[in-house]
Interface confidence: low
Amino acid sequence: MAVTACQGLGFVVSLIGIAGIIAATCMDQWSTQDLYNNPVTAVFNYQGLWRSCVRESSGFTECRGYFTLLGLPAMLQAVRALMIVGIVLGAIGLLVSIFALKCIRIGSMEDSAKANMTLTSGIMFIVSGLCAIAGVSVFANMLVTNFWMSTANMYTGMGGMVQTVQTRYTFGAALFVGWVAGGLTLIGGVMMCIACRGLAPEETNYKAVSYHASGHSVAYKPGGFKASTGFGSNTKNKKIYDGGARTEDEVQSYPSKHDYV
C-alpha cells in the first residue's frame, strides 16, 4: 500500500512539476525591468526565451519575437535547449509512468516490468528536473553578471516610436516557477525510484546453490547479487572449485576471485 502511495504521489508531483516547466518555458517574464530607480515609469519591459514585451501604463501590451542580425546568443539557445529537453524527457517519463502505476492493470504485466518502468520514469523525471533547474540557473547567472549593462527597446505609444533607454533587468516570475517546477519534478523522480524498490518482486535473499568439492565436505554459497535482487537470478549451479583435493579449511577460508559470480 505504501509503495502504491509513494508511486502515485511521485507521479502527481512530477506531473505538476512538468506542467510548471512547460509554463515557465512559455512565460515572457524571464527577466523583468528593474524599477528600483524609476518606480513610476510609463512603460514596463519584460523578456522571455522567445520574445520581448512592453506594457504601457494604459494597459496596452505589445510583444515581439527577437529580431537580430547577429543571431541569438549561444547561451540563450542553450537555455532554450535545456528547457525543451526537460519537457520532452518529462513527457516521456509521464507516459511511461502511467503504464507503470501499480493501480492500473494492463494485461498480464508482471511486477518486475512495472518496477523497471517505474525506475525508468523516475530517472527521466530526475534528469528532466535537473535540465529545468540548470536552464533557469544559467539564465539567472547571466542576468546577475550582466545586470548593469542590459538595455531595452521601449516602444512609446501605438505608433511604435522607439527610444533607447538604459534599463536594468532582474529576475522574472518565470525563473521562480522554473526552479520550483524543476525541484518538484526532481522530487517526483526520486519518489518513483523509491517506489521501484518496493515494486520489485521479492525473492529469497539466500538461494542456496550447491557446489561440489572433491573432498568430504560440501560448501554452500549464496546466489550473490543477482539472486538477491528481482532483476535476474543465478539458477545454474556453478562449480567454483576445480575438484582438486583440498581440506575443508582451504575451501572456506581463502576467498577466490571466482567466489562472486
Epitope: 527577466s31 537580430t68 542580425l69 547577429l70 539564465f139 547571466m142 550582466n146 527597446n153 533607447t164
Partner: nanobody, 119 residues
Framework: QLQLVESGGGLVQPGGSLRLSCAAS???????MAWYRQAPGKQRELVAG???????NYADSVKGRFTISRDFAKNTVDLQMNSLKPEDTAVYYC??????????????WGQGTQVTVSS
C-alpha cells in the same frame, strides 16, 4: 551611449532613387547595422542589414533594388534605394546592435527619416 542620426529621406517619384545615410556617434563600434521601416498601421520590418563580418540580409521585397553599405572607420551605414515603388513609402529607421554578452544584443535606434514614393 550610441546616437544614430539619419539623413537623406524625402519625396521621390516611382522608379526614382534615394540614398539614406546613418551616422553613429559614440565610443563603441556596433557589431551590426541595419535599416528598418515602418509603414502607417504596419509593424516595423527589416529592410537591410549588415554585420561586422560583412554578411548582409535583405527583405525579399527589396532584393535587387536596395543595397546596404557600411564604413567601419566612420561608423556609418548607407542604404541605396533604386526603382522605388509606392509601397516603399514608410519611416525608415537606422538600427545598431552591439553584442555585449547579454542574452539580448543592445539595440540602438535613430529617430527615423520619412521616405515618400508618390507621383
Amino acid at each position: 551611449q550610441l546616437q544614430l542620426v539619419e539623413s537623406g529621406g524625402g519625396l521621390v517619384q516611382p522608379g526614382g532613387s534615394l540614398r539614406l545615410s546613418c551616422a553613429a556617434s559614440g565610443e563603441i563600434s556596433s557589431d551590426a547595422m541595419a535599416w528598418y521601416r515602418q509603414a502607417p498601421g504596419k509593424q516595423r520590418e527589416l529592410v537591410a542589414g549588415m554585420t561586422r563580418g560583412g554578411s548582409t540580409n535583405y527583405a525579399d521585397s527589396v532584393k535587387g533594388r536596395f543595397t546596404i553599405s557600411r564604413d567601419f572607420a566612420k561608423n556609418t551605414v548607407d542604404l541605396q534605394m533604386n526603382s522605388l515603388k509606392p509601397e516603399d513609402t514608410a519611416v525608415y529607421y537606422c538600427n545598431a546592435e552591439i553584442y555585449t554578452g547579454t542574452f539580448y544584443p543592445r539595440s540602438y535606434w535613430g529617430q527615423g527619416t520619412q521616405v515618400t514614393v508618390s507621383s
